[in-house]
Interface confidence: low
């Protein structure tokens, strides 16, 4: 019983349960391949508990190993469109500070219109995650087709 | 030491570790796009710890943020078949209570025969998740090709 | 406060937070379809906290339900290459002890050059996971394109 009470008394944040699920806000300016994200209950089923958004990019607030996941669907897309506009590639990486820039996860669309993947990776407080979509096709803003999230797993 | 003992004395369910992994039982009758799932140790590696099945659909028993994941492989499928029968689409959503009906995750097969994705989403006790497969192609019932699961992540 | 103290006093391992993320080391010799993995901070962002590597295969050290995830990208690949060399298939399974050999997750590449998926599955101490890539195409060793990992979720 003691454990359950103690667990209730402590703020969840002290248990390290940082988690975020974001929806697409908009694409970047010309020559900026980044996707810009938004999150919060007012926007639907997206949320940020711990991590924060900085100019549409996700910033980590707690050191640890995270599960990073993403799905991006291209708008107005068929397998013909996708192959004609190849290569369209999505990369998730640490983009800040720039000196530590590293690609964590990369996928090409080839003849498909959706990519989805996930991976475990260590992240540090202050790391900013960028999602770069290179190519001429635009992503869908439907919240069930394009989303990006992280989940703190362990220290 | 106190913590470990307390943890052992408490039922796991009180820690909020609701989790389920399901295998395909069958497809719905004509005009019903839903996939019907089954789970339990007698069936192999599927299980339900917390959530329950209600007429083949997954019902949530604990409020919280969940990681929802799915993989569906089409049976007797090649890239030619998949493109010829396009659009074949899978959607995972909350189908009950009707007032909360919403699509959480959607993917089209295009020229592929398998889709797989995952996302974080808030779910409430009583939410029932439906997986709708639209199109004329049938899913594989192989347990390593088609599966659906949820994992409670945090309150 | 008591809970936080107790949590700090216990080694993380006793909380059951076994986790691993691996990068591709090499493919097997002819007639051996297995992928051989490596992990550790010296190699970049891969790591093993709990599970171990045994001749390039991942061995589980703690009973429980695990989230298993994988992404494999084929090297020197286009949708034409992928379809020409079809079937190229990836399967993740328990390959030891031999008496429990079972396929957990299977995907074909069809006209794509990357597969990515994840699933929940019960694993037991001593289970060794093998990832079999069948076909003539080779996987990319780029750490952001090909990776394999597990995360302990609950007992």
């Amino acid at each position: 019983q003691r454990f359950a009470q103690a667990q209730q008394q402590l703020p969840l944040e002290s248990l390290g349960w940082d988690v975020a699920e974001l929806q697409l806000n908009h694409t970047g300016p010309q020559q900026d391949p980044r996707l810009y994200w938004q999150g919060g209950p007012a926007l639907g089923r997206s949320f940020l508990h711990g991590p924060e958004l900085d100019k549409g990019q996700l910033r980590i607030h707690r050191d640890g190993i995270y599960m990073v996941h993403i799905q991006v669907t291209l708008a107005i897309c068929s397998s013909t469109t996708a192959s004609r506009h190849h290569p369209t590639t999505l990369a998730v990486g640490i983009c800040s500070p720039a000196s530590r820039s590293i690609s964590l996860l990369r996928l090409s669309f080839h003849q498909g219109c959706t990519i989805a993947s996930q991976r475990l990776t260590p992240l540090a407080r202050g790391d900013t995650l960028c999602t770069n979509l290179t190519g001429t096709l635009l992503p869908s803003r439907n919240t069930d087709e394009t989303f990006f999230g992280v989940q703190w797993v362990r220290p | 030491q106190r913590f470990a003992q307390a943890q052992q004395q408490l039922p796991l369910e009180s820690l909020g570790w609701d989790v389920a992994e399901l295998q395909l039982n069958h497809t719905g009758p004509q005009q019903d796009p839903r996939l019907y799932w089954q789970g339990g140790p007698a069936l192999g590696r599927s299980f339900l710890h917390g959530p329950e099945l209600d007429k083949g659909q997954l019902r949530i028993h604990r409020d919280g943020i969940y990681m929802v994941h799915i993989q569906v492989t089409l049976a007797i499928c090649s890239s030619t078949t998949a493109s010829r029968h396009h659009p074949t689409t899978l959607a995972v959503g909350i189908c009950s209570p009707a007032s909360r009906s919403i699509s959480l995750l959607r993917l089209s097969f295009h020229q592929g025969c398998t889709i797989a994705s995952q996302r974080l989403t808030p779910l409430a006790r009583g939410d029932t998740l439906c997986t709708n497969l639209t199109g004329t192609l049938l899913p594989s019932r192989n347990t390593d090709e088609t599966f659906f699961g949820v994992q409670w992540v945090r309150p | 406060q008591r809970f936080a103290q107790a949590q700090q006093q216990l080694p993380l391992e006793s909380l059951g937070w076994d986790v691993a993320e691996l990068q591709l080391n090499h493919t097997g010799p002819q007639q051996d379809p297995r992928l051989y993995w490596q992990g550790g901070p010296a190699l970049g962002r891969s790591f093993l906290h709990g599970p171990e590597l045994d001749k390039g295969q991942l061995r589980i050290h703690r009973d429980g339900i695990y989230m298993v995830h994988i992404q494999v990208t084929l090297a020197i690949c286009s949708s034409t290459t992928a379809s020409r060399h079809h079937p190229t298939t990836l399967a993740v399974g328990i390959c030891s002890p031999a008496s429990r050999s079972i396929s957990l997750l299977r995907l074909s590449f069809h006209q794509g050059c990357t597969i990515a998926s994840q699933r929940l599955t019960p694993l037991a101490r001593g289970d060794t996971l093998c990832t079999n890539l069948t076909g003539t195409l080779l996987p990319s060793r780029n750490t952001d394109e090909t990776f394999f990992g597990v995360q302990w979720v609950r007992p």
Partner: antibody, heavy 120, light 107 residues
């Protein structure tokens, strides 16, 4: 202290060339994109050109395309603007500015400017 | 090219006043807009970026809002040091462009 200092401005005749320099200090120069912006006397601001943090991309305003070249030397923490075939309408104060995010962000640090006068 | 039109071009106000400057883009630029303050003989200074984000060191009386094509810069309680020229800047498409400026004079 983070600082940008321009030099190389002066009076020059139409059709001639001039090379401006911008020396950076107080930050990791190789992490940032750099821009040149100019301001004709009594007028507003006009963006001229940008160079990526690693020199991999360069873009120019139509008014200077083919005449001006931006370059950088990360080992010397310096960005350059080579101005050829100068015209009277190129007369302005030239500012170098740091790109806030390394892609196309805002210009968070500016130099004090160097005056270029093109006149016969 | 994307045209940015600021209004008004000239503005007279007194210390303590609340002033609003608008910037209209000829096409959508998402949130990729910045505001600068420039005093005579000095380089511009960044006030707002990404439409509404304040850099450190900028007083909280400055705020920005808007997205798409309509943006505003608001100064809630003018201080003597705020009398200057203000420029908006779009960074969504090359070439990067600036508004024509708004000169804020003391009344």
């Amino acid at each position: 202290e983070v600082e940008l200092v321009e030099s190389g401005g002066g009076m020059v005749q139409p059709g001639r060339s001039l090379r401006l320099s911008c020396a950076a200090s107080g930050f990791t120069f190789s992490d940032y994109g750099m821009h040149w912006v100019r301001q004709a006397p009594g007028m507003g601001l006009e963006w001229v050109t940008v160079i990526w943090y690693d020199g991999s991309n360069k873009y120019y305003a139509d008014s200077v395309k083919g005449r001006f070249t931006i370059s950088r030397d990360n080992s010397k923490n310096t960005v350059f603007l080579q101005m050829n075939s100068l015209r009277a309408e190129d007369t302005a104060v030239y500012y170098c500015a740091r790109d806030e995010v390394g892609f196309v962000g805002a210009f968070d640090i500016w130099g004090q400017g160097t005056m270029v006068t093109v006149s016969s | 090219d994307i045209q940015l039109t600021q209004s008004p071009s000239f503005l007279s106000a007194s210390v303590g006043d609340r002033v609003i400057i608008t910037c209209r883009a000829s096409q959508g630029i998402n949130s990729h807009l910045a505001w600068y303050q420039q005093k005579p003989g000095k380089a511009p200074k960044l006030l707002i970026y990404y439409a509404s984000t304040l850099p450190s060191g900028v007083p909280s009386r400055f705020s920005g809002s808007g997205s798409g094509t309509e943006f505003t810069l608001t100064v809630t309680s003018l201080q003597p040091e705020d009398f200057a020229t203000y420029y908006c800047q779009q960074l969504n498409h090359y070439p990067i462009t600036f508004g024509q400026g708004t000169r804020l004079d003391i009344n």
